[in-house]
């Protein structure tokens, strides 16, 4: 029940940050003119990934797309890349996820297909929330990098006759959203891990076979258990596949490949 | 047509106060921020503020923040203008002009108000 | 403040001739978000209120004869009338409207010879 709660909880949250990484990457609020000690404009501009804005006073916004490709700074190109890797990333893991889930039964998938699957969508997740996180840091180091020299512009002067007040950016709606939406992935992303561990039969399920020695009886189960050398029926040491709730005695059980993450 | 009605003419003694009116029509009033302008006889012209009638919210130049007060009666679309402590440098024709809606220029003026200051 | 700085003034001419008036501003107009600029022409009468002409420095107001015509960036702006036709004399003022508080020109006076 644990694992199946773990695995649909880390699936919403990866969901939902995925959704997050889009939204972001289609808002046009990744910077916005810096309105704080700057000579107030009578127009606002703020910028995205594909094209930038200016917000008139009246509230009539015009917004004009980035037509080239060549002409674009390479950083935005690589933010631009690394939104789209998340995005595409987190789409397949949401698509494997789906089919991983413990509460969805699709003809006769094997528990262990289903942990494989919950692993990869994981695996995916955390990339794809490293990607996000990665590409809104970068422009945003790209922002503050630009706003201190256009800083450094603005009080050093031009030595012309003609004074140039540069536009500053800072950080717009669109970055929190988008490293926001990255921590969300990546927290489904290693939820779906943890449930994959749990999901993992630890091997073959053999029914345990008894031989009597004269004396106690010892039960020899195969697995590397703990010979169990107690009187009448022994539920305790019992290999029953529980779903990853597990005893005290499973723990030095071989290990699974699932077992590292 | 947009029409912005002003009075002609209002004579004030110094230090006094007067309210100038600017009745709209022929468009949403709300819609259009409202901007005052000072035109000293045979001089250039001085923007003084403006007003959004939706909500009140205004800029002002800061060389007229005291003496000019910007407000809107919506009921009415009405856009008033207060001058407070007249002196004779108050006296000029005040127009109110509707800002575009594309640009920040102002599209239509009104025929504009002569405050005179005398005592 | 944003300076505007107008010239000449007063400017003579006579009738068909083409004139030329220019606008300087203390600071660029240009808007680099929408690469506009953002410069007003307008003109006015005697006894009149002023006439929106041009804004956005180069685009003509509807109803504005087409032989006005504005040009120029960042800080140098010039408005050219091609023909000058008598209801054309009147003050020409240019405007900044990009800064805060917006401000206008001293003005041109077209007049006759």
């Known amino acids: 029940m644990a694992v199946t709660a773990c695995q649909g909880l880390g699936f919403v949250v990866s969901l939902i940050g995925i959704a997050g990484i889009i939204a972001a990457t289609c808002m046009d609020q990744w910077s916005t003119q810096d309105l704080y000690n700057n000579p107030v404009t009578a127009v606002f501009n703020y910028q995205g990934l594909w094209r930038s804005c200016v917000r008139e006073s009246s509230g009539f916004t015009e917004c004009r797309g980035y037509f080239t490709l060549l002409g674009l700074p390479a950083m935005l190109q690589a933010v631009r890349a690394l939104m789209i890797v998340g995005i595409v990333l987190g789409a397949i893991g949401l698509l494997v996820s789906i089919f991983a889930l413990k509460c969805i039964r699709i003809g006769s998938m094997e528990d262990s297909a289903k942990a494989n699957m919950t692993l990869t969508s994981g695996i995916m997740f955390i990339v794809s929330g490293l990607c996000a996180i990665a590409g809104v840091s970068v422009f945003a180091n790209m922002l503050v990098t630009n706003f201190w020299m256009s800083t450094a512009n603005m009080y050093t002067g031009m030595g012309g006759m003609v004074q140039t007040v540069q536009t500053r950016y800072t950080f717009g709606a669109a970055l929190f959203v988008g490293w926001v939406a990255g921590g969300l992935t990546l927290i489904g992303g290693v939820m779906m891990c943890i449930a994959c561990r749990g999901l993992a039969p630890e091997e073959t399920n053999y029914k345990a076979v008894s031989y009597h020695a004269s004396g106690h009886s010892v039960a020899y189960k195969p697995g590397g258990f703990k010979a169990s050398t107690g009187f009448g029926s022994n539920t305790k040491n019992k290999k029953i596949y529980d779903g990853g709730a597990r005893t005290e005695d499973e723990v030095q059980s071989y290990p699974s490949k699932h077992d590292y993450v | 047509q947009v029409q912005l009605q002003q009075p002609g003419t209002e004579l004030v003694k110094p230090g006094a106060s007067v309210k100038v009116s600017c009745k709209a029509s022929g468009y949403t009033f709300t819609t259009y921020w409202m901007h005052w302008v000072k035109q000293r006889p045979g001089q250039g012209l001085e923007w003084i503020g403006r007003?959004?009638?939706?909500?009140?919210?205004?800029n002002y130049n800061q060389k007229f923040k005291g003496k000019a007060t910007l407000t809107v009666d919506k009921s009415s679309d009405t856009a008033y203008m207060q001058l407070n402590g007249l002196t004779s440098e108050d006296s000029a024709v005040y127009y109110c002009?509707?800002?575009?809606?594309?640009?920040?220029?102002?599209?239509?003026w009104g025929q504009g108000t002569l405050v005179t200051v005398s005592a | 403040d944003i300076v505007m700085t107008q010239s000449p003034s007063p400017l003579t001419v006579t009738a068909g001739e083409k004139v030329t008036m220019t606008c300087k501003s203390s600071q660029t107009l240009l808007n680099r978000g929408n690469q506009k600029n953002y410069l007003t022409w307008y003109q006015q009468k005697p006894g009149q209120p002023p006439k929106l002409l041009i804004y956005?420095?180069?685009t003509r107001e509807s109803g504005v004869p087409d032989r006005f015509t504005g040009s120029g960036s960042g800080t140098d702006f010039t408005l050219t009338i091609n023909s000058v036709q008598a209801e054309d004399l009147a003050v020409y003022y240019c405007?900044?409207?990009?800064?805060?508080?917006?401000?206008f020109g001293s003005g041109t006076k077209l007049e006759t010879r």
């Open positions: 002009a509707m800002g575009a809606y594309f640009s920040n220029s102002f599209a239509y």
């Open positions: 956005w420095a180069s």
């Open positions: 405007q900044n409207d990009y800064f805060f508080p917006f401000t």
């Open positions: 007003i959004r009638p939706s909500d009140s919210d205004s």
